[in-house]
């Protein structure tokens, strides 16, 4: 009922709570002497559904049959209208339209941990739109029945708030949930389980790892578990991997030896627990333990290469280069590299430890036979040394690879191809392809890159440290015993026309011809490998086409003579540079007038 209803009553038949689709009769009746003063037959009773007028009647009462009410709550209000006055509220009623509860489905119960509480979930089915009470009931041994009621409006979860104990782990319990509202009731199918079925252990905790004698091969994982745990599963992986290694263990009692861990690797470990071989469920995975395994002495051998440079008649410079061991070979933090240089006939040896670099340069006599050995050391020991004899890598002309070419192969790759040397190709033990950025000064500080190729290969794709629009000097070495032959070529992965032309810095006259000198184009403006320079000239103030001279590009060249100029004529000269992609813009213009006689 709404408000005090002093003036009259609203009654609802058959009930204030009805099934969707049902019809209700609503009666509004005035109490004695509560109609319009003096004109009781003028009483006009009006029935409102919310704010909408749906019926009216003159007299002391009004009857209305209402159908098609929607799910939920509908408010009806009865008002009295008298002549010359506002409508007066008489009384009202709420009608609740809903449905009987559907059978709850998929009832399932779980207890999280041996000390946890039993909680059950289910699916309610469609909304009843009415106050519906859910009662969760659990029947167990000793003829006992536990139950709890749900006070929430949408109830699909209930926690008993108490704990099942393992005193009879195989005893059966049967759960059932019953939904009741004004229109009916329905119970779920029973769900029967034992303690072992519903207790989901807490994840293991306090996970630790120990390496006996700081060795990766003697590793034990320790953890703590709830008392009844029978099974564990362990998973572990290197921190940079997505794939887990899995191990199942029974009656581990909080420890397990791991035998297949890699040295000097950060691993992530997790553990899960279960109470019974085939009953119940696995716990959540424990929090991760992250731990680094100890170092072991390096395996594998360094890949070493070298470069020789003539200094003078008695001395030569040797630059040694080596590549870092892979993580799996280094098996620890490399603390230093040990380089030993030995003159093989005299037996003199010099050893040096190098930290922070993967190269070493020294000066040795040009006489004698020299060998080097390089090894990598971590806290546990050293790798096997890589030994190489220092020789003149390009001395054997007959071992030089033939028809070397370098072609761009996609983004930042160069495909180098060659033909075996003329000399017996089967004598080749391996090819080495070496590349470095081309610097006009022949700078020895420019990083050197190399890769080794099997003797039956006649191509190699180079991609390491290759940048677009940079020219590389590429050498292919064929090695056979203590001999080597080489061929070289320039190559780039991507090219375009140079951004500028050479800058003419001087023009000098020599015996009737001129010598033009220029500054090299800065490397970053060359935009690939230069193929040619062009020198252009024309008479000043002339509109004729310029003449030109094309010079093949050579790294060290920066001057060229021209002998086809007329004396006492002023010429304008300029230069351009070309890559395979095209010609640069003009360099600077210089004027020159030849004084002497033409040849």
């Amino acid at each position: 009922k709404i408000d005090a209803c002093k003036r009259g009553d609203v009654t609802v038949k058959p009930s204030h709570v009805i099934l969707l689709g049902s019809t209700v009769n609503i009666t509004c009746s005035l109490k004695p002497r509560q109609g319009c003063f003096h004109y009781s037959r003028r009483n006009k009773l009006i029935l409102y559904k919310f704010d909408r007028r749906i019926n009216f009647h003159h007299g002391h009462s009004l009857n209305s049959q209402v159908t098609g009410l929607p799910l939920g709550t509908t408010l009806f209000v009865c008002k009295l209208a008298c002549i010359n006055s506002d409508e007066i509220q008489i009384c009202g009623a709420e009608i609740f339209v809903g449905v009987a509860p559907e059978q709850p489905q998929n009832l399932s119960c779980i207890q999280k941990g041996e000390q946890g509480t039993v909680a059950c979930t289910w699916e309610r089915g469609r909304d009843t739109h009415l106050y519906t009470e859910y009662t969760l009931q659990l029947s167990g041994p000793k003829n006992l029945t536990w139950q709890k009621q749900c006070k929430d409006i949408y109830c699909d979860y209930l926690d008993f708030g108490i704990n099942l104990t393992p005193e009879s782990p195989e005893s059966n319990f049967t759960a059932k949930v019953t939904a009741v509202n004004s229109l009916g009731s329905s119970s779920s199918l029973p769900s029967t389980f034992t303690f072992l079925d519903i207790v989901r252990p807490l994840p293991p905790w306090d996970i630790r790892i120990k390496f006996q004698k700081a060795s990766v091969s003697r590793c034990t994982l320790y953890w703590r578990d709830e008392g009844l745990v029978l099974l564990n599963r362990l998973r572990y992986r290197p921190s940079n991997s997505r794939l887990w290694n899995m191990v199942n263990v029974t009656k581990a009692k909080g420890r397990h030896d791991l035998l297949d861990l890699k040295p000097f690797t950060e691993y992530e470990f997790q553990i899960s627990s279960k109470l019974h071989l085939y009953k119940g469920s696995w716990s959540d995975w424990s929090e991760s333990l992250r731990a680094q395994t100890p170092e072991e002495e390096p395996t594998g051998m360094l890949d070493v290469w070298y470069m020789k440079r003539h200094i003078d008649y008695s001395r030569q410079q040797i630059s040694l280069f080596w590549k870092n061991l892979s993580v799996s070979e280094a098996r620890g933090k490399i603390l230093h590299y040990q380089v030993t240089l030995q003159e093989l006939t005299g037996g003199k040896a010099m050893t040096q430890n190098i930290t922070g670099h993967t190269s070493w340069t020294t000066v040795i006599p040009r006489t004698g036979n020299w060998a080097v050995a390089v090894s990598a050391a971590n806290s546990k020991g050293s790798s096997l040394p890589t030994r190489i004899n220092i020789m003149n890598l390009c001395e054997a002309g007959l071992l030089a690879p033939r028809q070397v070419s370098a072609n761009s192969e996609g983004m930042d790759n160069i495909l180098v191809t060659w033909q075996p040397p003329r000399k017996d190709p089967s004598a080749v033990q391996e090819y080495v392809v070496e590349w470095r950025e081309l610097h006009p000064g022949g700078d020895t500080q420019v990083p050197l890159n190399w890769l080794r190729s099997r003797p039956y290969n006649v191509s190699a794709l180079i991609s390491e440290n290759i940048k677009s629009y940079i020219c590389y000097e590429i050498r292919v070495y064929a090695l056979s015993g203590d001999q080597g032959g080489c061929s070289s070529i320039l190559g780039n992965s991507k090219h375009k026309a140079p951004l500028s032309g050479p800058h003419i810095n001087a023009i000098t006259e020599e015996k009737g011809s001129i010598l033009i000198s220029w500054n090299s184009i800065p490397v970053q403006e060359q935009m690939g490998c230069l193929l040619h320079y062009r020198i252009y000239w024309k008479e000043r103030d002339s509109n004729s086409q310029p003449q030109l001279c094309e010079i093949p590009y050579r790294v060290s060249q920066n001057s060229h003579p021209i002998n086809s100029l007329q004396p006492r004529v002023t010429y304008v000269l300029w230069m351009t540079a070309l890559t395979a992609a095209g010609e640069s813009s003009h360099g600077n213009e210089r004027e020159f007038c030849l004084q002497g006689k033409a040849n």
């Epitope: 006992l144 536990w146 708030g161 108490i162």
Partner: nanobody, 125 residues
């Protein structure tokens, strides 16, 4: 100090009803499990009903549907409504209180720390 005092016992005809009450002082009933036990002459004390601190009720199947346990936090009391009484319900009824958090423990006498003196219920045929 904790005290439990039962009331509401008496004589009643078979089929009748009684409402027993247990008033508690010294501890809030909302924080504890509350139980009712009974002992008939010459028999062992037996479990009748209990209510956990989390509002889970437990009954033996022999009384389920006839007996209801409820808590009145405002009065710091627990009630036992008994309907359709039978002569075999004749016994001294005891109220008990304890910090019990397990299903099985709610029906076990030795889990309850505090006990009342009991109230007599007699059902005649």
């Amino acid at each position: 100090q904790v005290q439990l005092q039962e009331s509401g016992g008496g004589s009643v005809q078979a089929g009748g009803s009684l409402r027993l009450s247990c008033a508690v002082s010294g501890r809030p009933v909302s924080d504890y499990a509350m139980g009712w036990f009974r002992q008939a002459p010459g028999k062992e004390r037996e479990f009748v009903a209990a209510l956990s601190a989390s509002d889970t009720t437990v009954y033996p199947n022999s009384v389920k549907g006839r007996i209801t346990i409820s808590r009145d936090n405002a009065k710091n009391a627990v009630d036992l409504q008994m309907n359709a009484l039978k002569p075999e319900d004749t016994a001294v009824y005891y109220c008990a209180m304890g910090p019990i958090g397990t299903f099985q423990g709610l029906a076990r006498q030795n889990e309850y720390h505090y006990w009342g003196q009991g109230t007599q219920v007699t059902v005649s045929s």
